[in-house]
């Protein structure tokens, strides 16, 4: 049996199929590679993108964000906040864009503090450290390819392969390894 | 174009292909579905399984584990400990097994404390909560299927589809929503 991502012409047997520009909608991955059952939109780093972009659009018309600063946690703000805001190692999500990857846009977590929030004071303490938690995500990667066997890339033609990438999904508060 | 996971005989066009027992090595997914480029072993919940099983085997010949208790990391242990042990919302990994899933074995994180470790006292405090961080992982799911079109499952025959499942990857320490 042959890898479903490697279905090509007989002469490219066992190598990624090279798709022409005509076969690729807007330069993205061919629909049959985006396995219908996979429901990519369910993946958290994908699902978060639209809400992040909407929030970013609102903020541009609102006030500038101080999201990259380590916040002061106030008890009254905790009641409605999400995990990433209630955490004493809080994080924000950044949209990471890669034109040669599917999904092209993924939400990456970024710790907002080097230390953690001391719950007694609501302020950052250096006695603890915020560290990212990484997870693996399966993505499709595209590369230019040759359709005529010459080895020279054919304009607009791409081959696709799968790979796991490390995606930061949140932050946890740890005792520092060394001072 | 057709979904690579849906490549079947003409009469099953657009539905998952039904594989016979002979086509399936030891009842697992057909090799060509386990996309060569995907390198499943790189996925963290997969990669952790072998080390966890080895550690579990060692522990059975060693002393019983108190891994489900909320631990306190000793100051001298902080220097060499891993993130899941140094976290003030520590967790352990449990091997989750599902015969009808590929990968069949995945490492799921489980918080060891209901609260978090107070970095001042070294004791668990209920003033904070440990919560799991969930991530999506793409897996293959198998279901019994019919090879003769009767609708009755053919013994040993399976169809496969992809789905995202939520995998707990670690724990973070949060201010509780309500006091």
């Amino acid at each position: 049996h042959q890898d479903p991502f490697l279905r090509g012409h007989p002469h490219t047997h066992g190598t990624p199929r090279c798709y022409s520009a005509e076969e690729l909608p807007l330069g993205q991955a061919p629909p049959h590679l985006l396995a219908r059952g996979a429901k990519w939109g369910q993946a958290l780093p994908v699902a978060l993108v639209s809400s992040l972009e909407a929030a970013g659009h609102r903020r541009r018309h609102d006030r500038p964000s101080a999201a990259t600063q380590c916040p002061v946690l106030r008890p009254e703000e905790v009641l409605e906040a999400d995990t990433h805001q209630r955490s004493i190692s809080p994080w924000r999500y950044r949209v990471d864009t890669d034109e040669d990857r599917y999904p092209q846009k993924l939400a990456f977590a970024e710790c907002l503090c080097r230390g953690c929030i001391d719950p007694r004071t609501g302020r950052e303490t250096a006695a603890l450290n915020s560290v990212r938690l990484l997870q693996s995500l399966l993505v499709l990667r595209r590369r230019p390819c040759s359709r005529d066997g010459s080895g020279l890339p054919t304009p607009g033609a791409f081959a696709f392969h799968t790979e796991f990438i490390r995606v930061p999904v949140g932050c946890t508060c740890v005792l520092p390894r060394s001072v | 174009h057709q979904d690579p996971f849906l490549r079947g005989h003409p009469h099953t066009h657009g539905t998952p292909r039904c594989y016979s027992a002979e086509e399936l090595p030891l009842g697992q997914a057909p090799p060509h579905l386990l996309a060569r480029g995907a390198k499943w072993g790189q996925a963290l919940p997969v990669a952790l399984v072998s080390s966890l099983e080895a550690a579990g085997h060692r522990r059975r010949h060693d002393r019983p584990s108190a891994a489900t208790q909320c631990p306190v990391l000793r100051p001298e242990e902080v220097l060499e400990a891993d993130t899941h042990q140094r976290s003030i919302s520590p967790w352990r990994y449990r091997v989750d097994t599902d015969e009808d899933r590929y990968p069949q074995k995945l490492a799921f994180a489980e918080c060891l404390c209901r609260g978090c470790i107070d970095p001042r006292t070294g004791r668990e405090t209920a003033a904070l909560n440990s919560v799991r961080l969930l991530q999506s992982l793409l897996v293959l799911r198998r279901r019994p299927c019919s090879r003769d079109g009767s609708g009755l499952p053919t013994p040993g025959a399976f169809a496969f589809h992809t789905e995202f499942i939520r995998v707990p990857v670690g724990c973070t320490c949060v201010l509780p929503r309500s006091v």
Epitope: T125, A126, A127, P176, V179 | R74, P75, P119, G122
Partner: antibody, heavy 120, light 112 residues
Framework: QVQLVESGGGLVKPGGSLRLSCAAS????????ISWIRQAPGKGLEWVSY????????YYAESVKGRFTISRDNAKNSLYLQMNSLRAEDTAVYYC?????????????WGQGTLVTVSS | QSALTQPASVSGSPGQSITISCTGT?????????VSWYQQHPGKAPKLMIY???KRPSGVSNRFSGSKSGNTASLTISGLQAEDEADYYC???????????FGGGTKLTVLG
């Protein structure tokens, strides 16, 4: 007010034993890790040992391991250091000190110290 | 031998500022801003002056401040006063062998 008071120091011959005590008041003693720290005459500070808040965990500097034993009685708000096989180089003022973070050398409350002299 | 290196002595006149350095390695002082500083008057117990590199416990004068650059932590005393004359020690976490380490100490002399 918050305080630690050491006692039990004195003159002892090499190879002898001594038991130091540290009485705590003004704070919840059972919530804190406590350390013993010593200072030889005219020298700097040297960390000796810690004990966890519950007393279940102890740790010692290499220089005293196997000779000194730290213990506590939370019901009596008291800390102890049993010193055996004493050597001349153990001569020092011994301080008990409270750790403000259990895993860091932030000693926010100190006793006044008790002098231990090991001499023949 | 101390893992943290301090100058044996520093001096300054009343009203001046002085700085005491505490040099470690990239794996101790350099990694995190977690050095603490202690003041010790002759015949007295040490007193915590700075923790987490730059924080002052309540009751400590704001003339005392801490900072870090690279592998060196520093204690700065501004507006020097006669009562600041004392020994000063920095402290850090060490290794499994010596869990907590102190610098060798610096004798501060206030001139005049």
């Amino acid at each position: 007010q918050v305080q630690l008071v050491e006692s039990g120091g004195g003159l002892v011959k090499p190879g002898g034993s001594l038991r130091l005590s540290c009485a705590a008041s003004g704070f919840t003693f059972s919530d804190h890790y406590i350390s013993w720290i010593r200072q030889a005459p005219g020298k700097g500070l040297e960390w000796v040992s810690y004990i966890s808040s519950s007393g279940s965990t102890t740790y010692y500097a290499e220089s005293v391991k196997g000779r000194f034993t730290i213990s506590r009685d939370n019901a009596k708000n008291s800390l102890y250091l049993q010193m055996n096989s004493l050597r001349a180089e153990d001569t020092a003022v011994y301080y008990c000190a409270r750790q403000s973070y259990y895993f860091l050398p932030y000693f926010d409350v100190w006793g006044q110290g008790t002098l231990v002299t090991v001499s023949s | 031998q101390s893992a943290l290196t301090q100058p044996a002595s520093v001096s300054g006149s009343p009203g001046q500022s002085i700085t005491i350095s505490c040099t470690g390695t990239s794996s101790d002082v350099g990694s995190y801003n977690l050095v603490s500083w202690y003041q010790q008057h002759p015949g007295k117990a040490p007193k915590l002056m700075i923790y987490e590199g730059s924080k002052r416990p309540s009751g400590v004068s704001n003339r005392f401040s801490g900072s870090k650059s690279g592998n060196t932590a520093s204690l700065t005393i501004s507006g020097l006063q006669a009562e600041d004359e004392a020994d000063y020690y920095c402290a850090s976490r060490g290794s499994r062998r010596v869990l907590y380490v102190f610098g060798g100490g610096t004798k501060l002399t206030v001139l005049g």
